[in-house]
């Protein structure tokens, strides 16, 4: 029950953060106006991952999109491609967790599989939880130090006549969403991977025996040269040249009729 | 087409208040911040304070202050600008104001302020 | 608050003649935003409301004739009229649209020479 109630909670969880990060990649507020120096400003920039915007004093905004790949500056599509990856991580991650769900069953699939998926799924949250966590603050970072270089040169003079008053962004709405959301996500992964130790079933204390018998018996093996030439059900292709000596796969594997003496 | 229709001319004894009104049409009302300017006979424009009818927020001029209050009847699709404690210079023409880039003006509502 | 200081006050000249009018602001008027200058230009004749000739310091406005153009940047900005009609005759107002509280000029008024 509370293994279900873990699994369930990690999924909404999840969910919601996912949402979250998907919410934060699309606004347009990743970075808005400082209005420190200008309080009264008619004219309000803000900027997004995907376009940048002014709010008129007609209350009119207008938003145009980065027309440009190569132009936009690096750590920009940094910030781009992770919060992508997260997504498609996110998304892939939900769906994987959607069959793992132990309240839901599908034909006649095991808990060992269930709890496999699970612990993916969980995995991939938490991966699509950092790269989100990770995009956010590599934009933040990135609004720091532009933020400091402009106050440092905060009026650009024409000739050291005119003043120009320099904009300055400092962090958007859409970066303590993406933070936020991101921390939603890692949380609901790692209690996905919680959920997944509850959900796998107890290891069985006896393993299959296999007995060999102490001569070479490499000569009188059936398959043993379907097993060298790739042909047999041997498909690891593991050429058997020493009588008895086995690998550790073919030890653990079940024995067959041609095993016993 | 977009259009700005005002209320008509009043007369006011000083330290009373006066209410202009500005009936908009032809565009979404909450696409755009009402703003009130007005002229004062010979005198250059002079920006009063504006409304956000989306969500009512509003920004005045300093010099007004505390004398102005700028409403929007969002149903009626009509904002009302009221100016209170009125003197001899607040005679003035007062014009509603809106739509991208200032572009809409109301035909004007003359305000005497006259004891 | 913003300063625009219009010159000259009044203006004389004659139909078709080219006339230049300036507008100065105490501070820049330019967006880096969108690379604008938010400064407009109004056409105003006697007991009417004003007109809206140009935006962004030197788009004009539609349907406003294409004898007026505007130009300039961050403080200094100019509204040329390349061939003057007996309907231009009028007064010119310049405004900051970049800044609360949004100020005007105090108008260069055109008469007829």
């Known amino acids: 029950m509370a293994v279900t109630a873990c699994q369930g909670l990690g999924f909404v969880v999840s969910l919601i953060g996912i949402a979250g990060i998907i919410a934060a990649t699309c606004m347009d507020q990743w970075s808005t106006q400082d209005l420190y120096n200008n309080p009264v400003t008619a004219v309000f920039n803000y900027q997004g991952l995907w376009r940048s915007c002014v709010r008129e004093s007609s209350g009119f905004t207008e938003c145009r999109g980065y027309f440009t790949l190569l132009g936009l500056p690096a750590m920009l599509q940094a910030v781009r491609a992770l919060m992508i990856v997260g997504i498609v991580l996110g998304a892939i991650g939900l769906l994987v967790s959607i069959f793992a769900l132990k309240c839901i069953r599908i034909g006649s699939m095991e808990d060992s599989a269930k709890a496999n998926m699970t612990l993916t799924s969980g995995i991939m949250f938490i991966v699509s939880g950092l790269c989100a966590i990770a995009g956010v603050s590599v934009f933040a970072n990135m609004l720091v130090t532009n933020f400091w270089m402009s106050t440092a040169n905060m009026y650009t003079g024409m000739g050291g006549m005119v003043q120009t008053v320099q904009t300055r962004y400092t962090f958007g709405a859409a970066l303590f969403v993406g933070w936020v959301a991101g921390g939603l996500t890692l949380i609901g992964g790692v209690m996905m991977c919680i959920a997944c130790r509850g959900l796998a079933p107890e290891e069985t204390n006896y393993k299959a025996v296999s007995y060999h018998a102490s001569g070479h018996s490499v000569a009188y093996k059936p398959g043993g040269f379907k097993a060298s030439t790739g042909f047999g059900s041997n498909t690891k292709n593991k050429k058997i040249y020493d009588g008895g000596a086995r690998t550790e796969d073919e030890v653990q594997s079940y024995p067959s009729k041609h095993d016993y003496v | 087409q977009v259009q700005l229709v005002q209320s008509g001319a009043e007369v006011k004894k000083p330290g009373a208040s006066v209410k202009v009104s500005c009936k908009a049409s032809?565009?979404?009302?909450?696409?755009?911040?009402m703003h009130w300017v007005r002229q004062a006979p010979g005198q250059r424009l002079e920006w009063i304070g504006y409304i956000n009818p989306n969500n009512g927020g509003t920004s005045y001029n300093q010099k007004f202050k505390g004398r102005v209050t700028i409403t929007v009847d969002t149903s009626a699709s009509t904002a009302y600008m009221e100016l209170s404690s009125l003197r001899s210079e607040d005679t003035a023409v007062y014009y509603c104001?809106?739509?991208?880039?200032?572009?809409?003006w109301g035909q004007g509502t003359t305000v005497t302020v006259s004891s | 608050d913003i300063q625009m200081t219009q010159s000259p006050s009044s203006l004389s000249a004659s139909v078709g003649d080219r006339v230049t009018m300036t507008c100065k602001s105490s501070q820049s008027l330019f967006n880096s935003g969108n690379q604008k200058n938010y400064l407009t230009w109004y056409q105003q004749k006697p007991g009417k409301a004003p007109k809206l000739l140009i935006y962004?310091?030197?788009t004009r406005e539609s349907g406003v004739p294409s004898r007026f153009s505007g130009s300039g940047s961050g403080t200094d900005f100019t509204l040329t009229i390349s061939s003057l009609q007996p309907e231009d005759f009028a007064t010119y107002y310049c405004q900051n649209d970049y800044s609360y509280p949004l100020t005007f000029g105090g108008g260069t008024k055109l008469e007829i020479k």
């Open positions: 032809g565009y979404t009302f909450t696409d755009y911040n």
């Open positions: 962004w310091a030197s």
């Open positions: 104001v809106t739509t991208r880039y200032l572009a809409v």
